[in-house]
């Protein structure tokens, strides 16, 4: 999947664009908004009717090296009595993000952009019932 | 990908940190995941905390289209299909990395940007505040 170039209908390429070898692109990995702190909801992963746990995956050849993945705790959902209700389903909600992958080839290193699918949390849904003839 | 010579001390001396600027291949390695959540699942309609999906488009960003979730209700849908205000629909938010064209409008020069997106909604028991 190639990153689409900006169409001429939108913009003219500025003169100030840096020279880039063919088939590649320049990527500054100093993250914009790196230090922004967002007020996230307090421990919704344990207060949800479809609660989830977090696992941290670590890979030194990936940037960022730490990616957090959620896993739904139950197949069903938690009812008002605190019991699992298997007539409902806990399902994962996923979102794509970009990472930079470092690959070693002998004494050379190359960098590749990669899309990673992150499970962000879980939600409780009514199941789809398939009626078998 | 684009190869870059390692340090003269290769293979013993390895820089564990990523350089500030890298040259990367224009092809993105992925699993060909479907980026339109409306097509990939109907959880947004079937959830007890349903949400709407809003298209956010920015030609200076890759991906240029990101779908933002907005919870439909303040409460959650109960077994009778009514909104139960004793529970709360809350957004599940995630920080993701995208590419920002830098300098602006340049076709092959980008910087990583961290953005906060609401991916979906989940139903939670509210935090009850007891006022003294």
């Amino acid at each position: 999947r190639k990153i689409p170039k900006v169409g001429h209908t939108f913009f003219q390429k500025p003169e100030s664009c840096p020279p880039v070898p063919g088939g590649s692109m320049k990527l500054d990995i100093g993250i914009i908004n790196e230090n922004q702190r967002v007020s996230m909801s307090r421990n919704i992963e344990s207060r949800s009717t479809s609660p989830w746990n977090y696992t941290v995956t670590w890979d030194p050849n990936r940037y960022p090296s730490e990616v957090v993945q959620a896993q739904c705790r139950n197949l069903g959902c938690i009812n008002a009595q605190g019991k699992e209700d298997i007539s409902m389903n806990s399902v994962p909600i996923q979102q794509e993000t970009l990472v930079v992958r470092r690959k070693h080839q002998g004494c050379s290193v190359s960098f590749q952009l990669e899309k990673v699918l992150v499970t962000v949390g879980c939600t409780c849904v009514t199941p789809v019932i398939h009626h078998v003839q | 990908g684009i190869t870059i010579p390692r340090n003269p001390g290769c293979p013993n001396s390895e820089d564990k940190n990523f350089p500030r600027t890298v040259m990367v291949n224009l092809n993105i390695h992925n699993r060909n995941t479907n980026t339109n959540p409306k097509r990939s699942s109907d959880y947004y309609n079937r959830s007890t905390s349903p949400w709407n999906l809003h298209r956010n488009e920015d030609p200076e960003r890759y991906p240029s289209v990101i779908w933002e979730a907005k919870c439909r209700h303040l409460g959650c849908i109960n077994a009778d299909g009514n909104v139960d205000y004793h529970m709360n629909s809350v957004p599940i938010q995630q920080e993701i990395l995208v590419l920002r064209r830098e300098p602006p409008h340049c076709p092959n020069s980008f910087r990583l940007e961290k953005i906060l997106v609401s991916v979906g909604c989940t139903c939670v028991t509210p935090i009850v505040h007891h006022v003294a």
Epitope: S41 | W51, L74
Partner: nanobody, 125 residues
């Protein structure tokens, strides 16, 4: 930062109607629920109404249900409180409020981080 500015408050006869707009600027206000509160002289500030992020759902205090309606126009970054069948006891300063996270009940005052300066509504009998 979110800046909120309420307007539309004035003297109105009992049984009359008013529409209070609340214009938001700064951080995108569409990301979280918005609320209206009111404070009568010598009384605590109290919850009036709240609207969900999507605008598809709203919640109301019992004393205004059926008379007041909250709505939002994300294109204009504005939340409205439509007030009908006004009573003298609705006399108060009406405040618009925004929240930056949503993890508790929608009617709890401390969950709202940003407040407007208020607009005075007086209902005469």
């Amino acid at each position: 930062e979110v800046q909120l500015v309420e307007s539309g408050g004035r003297l109105v006869q009992a049984g009359g109607s008013l529409r209070l707009p609340c214009a938001a600027s700064g951080r995108t206000f569409t990301s979280y629920p918005m609320g209206w509160f009111r404070q009568a002289p010598g009384k605590e500030r109290e919850f009036v109404a709240a609207i969900s992020m999507s605008g598809d759902d709203a919640a109301y205090a019992d004393f205004v249900r059926g008379r007041f309606t909250i709505s939002r126009d994300d294109a204009r970054n504005t939340v409205y409180l439509h007030m009908t069948s006004l009573k003298p006891e609705d006399t108060a300063v009406y405040y618009c409020a925004a929240r930056t996270s949503y993890d508790g009940t929608y009617d709890y005052i401390d969950d709202y981080s940003y407040w407007g300066q208020g607009t005075q509504v007086t209902v005469s009998s």
